[in-house]
Interface confidence: low
C-alpha cells in the first residue's frame, strides 16, 4: 500500500504563439481545481476507462478575476498535494490523466458551472520511494508544470511497496535472512505473508498471497515433489497424483494479443505491443481517435477524427513509435563534435565539450584566432584547437612575418624562368609554352592546347602570376 502524490506547480499559457485568453473575467470570476486519474501499466489511456489505480480531486484554488486587457497569467492554484492512495503493489509503470477544471462563480442558477479547461496524459515509469519527478505537459496553448512521486505507507517498503517492515524484535540484528529496512535502519524486513498453507520449505512468495515453488516442487502449495520419469504428455496440466511436472502453457501461447498485436513474455505475465489504432491490455480496444489523446510525450495527433480513419502521431524530438511512446537514444547519432560528451536530458541534448571547444555541439574552436594577428595581410584560419595563418604571396612562417622567396618552390613549369615580383612571381616561359606557370604547350600552328593567351601576350612572354 502507498500513496501517489501530485504537486501542481503552475498552470498557464505555454510558450509559443497564440497565448490563450484568460478563462476568468470580471463578469465571471472563476477558480481552478484539478483531477488526476491513474491506471496501471503503459497500455490503456482512454479518458473514459476506469482509473484502476485510483483518482483524486484537488481543493478549489483562489478566486481569480482577470484584469481587463491583461494577458492570461499563470493562474492561482489550489493549496496542497493531490493524493491517490493505492491498496496493492505499486505497478512501476502507470498512465496518468490530469485535468484542469474551471469553476465559474457568477450568479448561475443552481450553483457554480464547471468546465474542462485542459487535459494532459502520459505514461511513465516510476519506482516507489524515489524522489519527486518533475514534468511539463502542454494541452493546446496551456502549459501544466507538476511533480509527482509514489511513496509506500508503513509497514510497506521497496520500489513496489511489497516488502514489509516491522520494528526489530532484538535490538542488535534482524532475524535470519532478513535485512534492515533502509532507510528505517531500526526496523527489519518482515517476511511476506504467503498464501495460507504454502510450504515454508519448498515455497516462497514475492507478493503477499502468492505461493511460488522452488525447483523440484509443484502443486498450488508447493507440497508435491516433481518426478521427471513418468511424464508422457509434452504439454498439459501437471498431475498432482504422479507429481509429474509438465510445463504449463506459456503466457504468450495462442497469442493473447488481438488485432495483430505482438506478444512478449514478462517476468510475471505478458505484454502486447499494439498496432496503430488499437490499445488496451490485449489490444482489444479499437476506434482510437485524436480525441482520445493517443500521442504521448507531447506528440501531435493528426487525422483520426472518426473511429474508422487512422490517426498519425507526429513525435517531438527525442521520441518515436506509433504513439511517440519510445524515447530515442539521440546520443547514438554522435551529435557532439570534437570529442564532446553527449548528454540526453530528455528535453534537449547537451554536449559537454573538451577543453578548447565550445558551442551547442562543440563545433567552435575556442580562441584559436582571438588576439592572433597574421602579419603582412595573412588571414587566420581556425582548426583543431590551434590557429594557423594563411599567408599572402611573398610571406611565410607561423605569423606570416618571414619574407618568402616565391621562386623557391620552382613554380614555373617546362623550364620556365622564375622572377620574384612585388605582387607575386613572374614566369618567363621557354619556347613552345605559355600560361601563368608555363603550364600550357603551344601548338605548332600557334594555337594553345588550353585557354587562348589573353590579348597582348604572346607565347613566351613573361606572365605575371596574380
Amino acid at each position: 500500500a502507498g500513496v501517489f502524490e501530485l504537486q501542481i506547480h503552475s498552470f498557464g499559457p505555454g510558450p509559443g504563439p497564440g497565448a490563450p485568453r484568460s478563462p476568468c473575467s470580471a463578469r465571471l470570476p472563476c477558480r481552478l481545481f484539478f483531477r488526476v486519474c491513474l491506471k496501471p501499466g503503459l497500455s490503456e489511456e482512454a479518458a473514459e476507462s476506469p482509473c484502476a489505480l485510483g483518482a483524486a480531486l484537488s481543493a478549489r484554488g483562489p478566486v481569480y478575476t482577470e484584469q481587463p486587457g491583461a494577458p492570461a497569467p499563470d493562474l492561482p492554484l489550489p493549496d496542497g498535494l493531490l493524493q491517490v492512495p493505492f491498496r496493492d503493489a505499486w505497478p512501476g509503470t502507470f498512465s496518468f490523466i490530469i485535468e484542469t477544471w474551471r469553476e465559474e462563480l457568477g450568479d448561475q442558477i443552481g450553483g457554480p458551472a464547471w468546465s474542462l479547461l485542459a487535459r494532459v496524459a502520459g505514461r511513465r515509469r516510476l519506482a516507489a520511494g524515489g524522489p519527486w519527478a518533475r514534468d511539463i505537459q502542454r494541452a493546446g496553448a496551456w502549459e501544466l508544470r507538476f511533480s509527482y512521486r509514489a511513496r509506500c505507507e508503513p509497514p510497506a517498503v521497496g520500489t513496489a511497496c511489497t516488502r514489509l517492515c516491522r520494528p526489530r524484535s532484538a535490538p542488535s540484528r534482524c532475524g535470519p535472512g532478513l535485512r534492515p529496512c533502509a532507510p528505517l535502519e531500526d526496523e527489519c524486513e518482515a517476511p511476506l505473508v504467503c498464501r495460507a498453507g504454502c510450504s515454508p520449505e519448498h515455497g516462497f512468495c514475492e507478493q503477499p498471497g502468492e505461493c511460488r515453488c522452488l525447483e523440484g516442487w509443484t502443486g498450488p502449495l508447493c507440497t508435491v515433489p516433481v518426478s521427471t520419469s513418468s511424464c508422457l504428455s509434452p504439454r498439459g496440466p501437471s498431475s498432482a497424483t504422479t507429481g509429474c511436472l509438465v510445463p504449463g502453457p506459456g503466457p504468450c501461447d495462442g497469442n493473447p494479443c488481438a488485432n495483430g498485436g505482438s506478444c512478449s513474455e514478462t517476468p510475471r505475465s505478458f505484454e502486447c505491443t499494439c498496432p496503430r489504432g488499437f490499445y488496451g491490455l490485449r489490444c482489444e480496444v479499437s476506434g482510437v481517435t485524436c480525441a482520445d489523446g493517443p500521442c504521448f510525450n507531447g506528440g501531435l495527433c493528426v487525422g483520426g477524427a472518426d473511429p474508422d480513419s487512422a490517426y498519425i502521431c507526429h513525435c517531438p524530438p527525442g521520441f518515436q513509435g506509433s504513439n511517440c511512446e519510445k524515447r530515442v537514444d539521440r546520443c547514438s547519432l554522435q551529435p557532439c563534435r570534437n570529442g564532446g560528451l553527449c548528454l540526453d536530458l530528455g528535453h534537449a541534448l547537451r554536449c559537454r565539450c573538451r577543453a578548447g571547444f565550445a558551442g551547442p555541439r562543440c563545433e567552435h574552436d575556442l580562441d584559436d584566432c582571438a588576439g592572433r594577428a597574421c602579419a603582412n595581410g595573412g588571414t587566420c584560419v581556425e582548426g583543431g584547437g590551434a590557429h594557423r595563418c594563411s599567408c599572402a604571396l611573398g610571406f611565410g612562417g607561423r605569423d606570416c612575418r618571414e619574407r618568402a622567396d616565391p621562386c623557391a618552390a620552382r613554380p614555373c613549369a617546362h623550364g620556365g624562368r622564375c622572377y620574384a615580383h612585388f605582387s607575386g612571381l613572374v614566369c618567363a616561359c621557354a619556347p613552345g609554352y605559355m600560361g601563368a606557370r608555363c603550364e600550357f604547350p603551344v601548338h605548332p600552328d600557334g594555337a594553345s592546347a588550353l585557354p587562348a593567351a589573353p590579348p597582348g601576350l604572346r607565347p613566351g612572354d613573361p606572365q605575371r602570376y596574380l
Epitope: P13, P15, P71, P131, W132, I136, S147
Partner: antibody, heavy 122, light 107 residues
Framework: QVQLVQSGAEVKKPGASVKVSCKAS????????IHWVRQAPGQGLEWMGW????????FYAQKFQGRVTMTRDTSISTVYMELSRLRSDDTAVYYC???????????????WGQGTTVTVSL | DIQMTQSPSSVSASVGDRVTITCRAS??????LAWYQQKPGKAPKLLIY???SLQGGVPSRFSGSGSGTDFTLTISSLQPEDLATYSC?????????FGQGTKLEIK
C-alpha cells in the same frame, strides 16, 4: 554574450510607483522565463515573481500580489517590473534573473542583471 | 511556502580550510535546489544547480550534495576570493524561496 542589463537607480516617495526594466541580449528572449528577486540592505534574497516572455504569463509571490506587475516587450527583448504603493521597506536592490528551466532539469537562475537600487524615502 | 533554513548564518575560516554550509527545506524538494555566491555590491552568481551539478566556469573546489530536505555546499579548500555570502534556493514549488544566506569570512 548572454546578459541582462537593468535600468538605473531610482529614488521614490512613499505611495509612488517604480518601473524597472531589464533588457536581454545574447540569447532567444522568448525561450527563457525571467524572475525578479529583491534584496533589502543587509538582508537575504527575496523572490518576487516570474514572467514567461513568450506568452506574457506571470506568477507573483503572495506578498506582492496586487502591487506588482510584470510585463514584457518582445520587440525590444525587455521585461519590466512595476511595483506600486511603495513603502520605505521596499527600499532594496531589485534584480532580474534568467530561469534555466528545461523540461526535466533545473539549471538555476543562471544569468542575473546588475541590479537596480530603489530608494523609498520622504 | 517552503521555508529554506541555512546554517550557520556566518562562518569564519582560514585559507585552505574545508568549509561546509547546510540548507534545510521545510518539505521534500527532491533535487530542485541551487546555490549562489554573492560578493559585496555584486549580483548573485550561480554555483550549483540541481543540488549537485557544477555550473560552467565555477572552480571544482565547490561541490553540492543532498536531496529531499537536506543539502550541503562544500568548499574543499578555501581561497581568499571565496569571501562572499552563499544562499540556497528551491525551485520545486512556486513561490521559489531562498535561504537567509551564510556569510563567509576569511580569518
Amino acid at each position: 554574450q548572454v546578459q541582462l542589463v537593468q535600468s538605473g537607480a531610482e529614488v521614490k516617495k512613499p505611495g509612488a510607483s517604480v518601473k524597472v526594466s531589464c533588457k536581454a541580449s545574447g540569447y532567444t528572449f522568448t525561450g527563457y522565463s525571467i524572475h525578479w528577486v529583491r534584496q533589502a540592505p543587509g538582508q537575504g534574497l527575496e523572490w518576487m515573481g516570474w514572467i514567461n516572455p513568450n506568452s506574457g504569463g506571470t506568477f507573483y509571490a503572495q506578498k506582492f500580489q496586487g502591487r506588482v506587475t510584470m510585463t514584457r516587450d518582445t520587440s525590444i527583448s525587455t521585461v519590466y517590473m512595476e511595483l506600486s504603493r511603495l513603502r520605505s521597506d521596499d527600499t532594496a536592490v531589485y534584480y532580474c534573473a534568467r530561469d534555466g528551466w528545461g523540461d526535466y532539469y533545473y539549471y538555476g537562475l543562471d544569468v542575473w542583471g546588475q541590479g537596480t537600487t530603489v530608494t523609498v524615502s520622504l | 511556502d517552503i521555508q529554506m533554513t541555512q546554517s550557520p548564518s556566518s562562518v569564519s575560516a582560514s585559507v585552505g580550510d574545508r568549509v561546509t554550509i547546510t540548507c534545510r527545506a521545510s518539505q521534500d524538494i527532491s533535487s530542485w535546489l541551487a546555490w549562489y555566491q554573492q560578493k559585496p555590491g555584486k549580483a548573485p552568481k550561480l554555483l550549483i544547480y540541481t543540488a549537485s551539478s557544477l555550473q560552467g566556469g565555477v572552480p571544482s573546489r565547490f561541490s553540492g550534495s543532498g536531496s529531499g530536505t537536506d543539502f550541503t555546499l562544500t568548499i574543499s579548500s578555501l581561497q581568499p576570493e571565496d569571501l562572499a555570502t552563499y544562499s540556497c534556493q528551491q525551485a520545486n514549488v512556486f513561490p521559489y524561496t531562498f535561504g537567509q544566506g551564510t556569510k563567509l569570512e576569511i580569518k
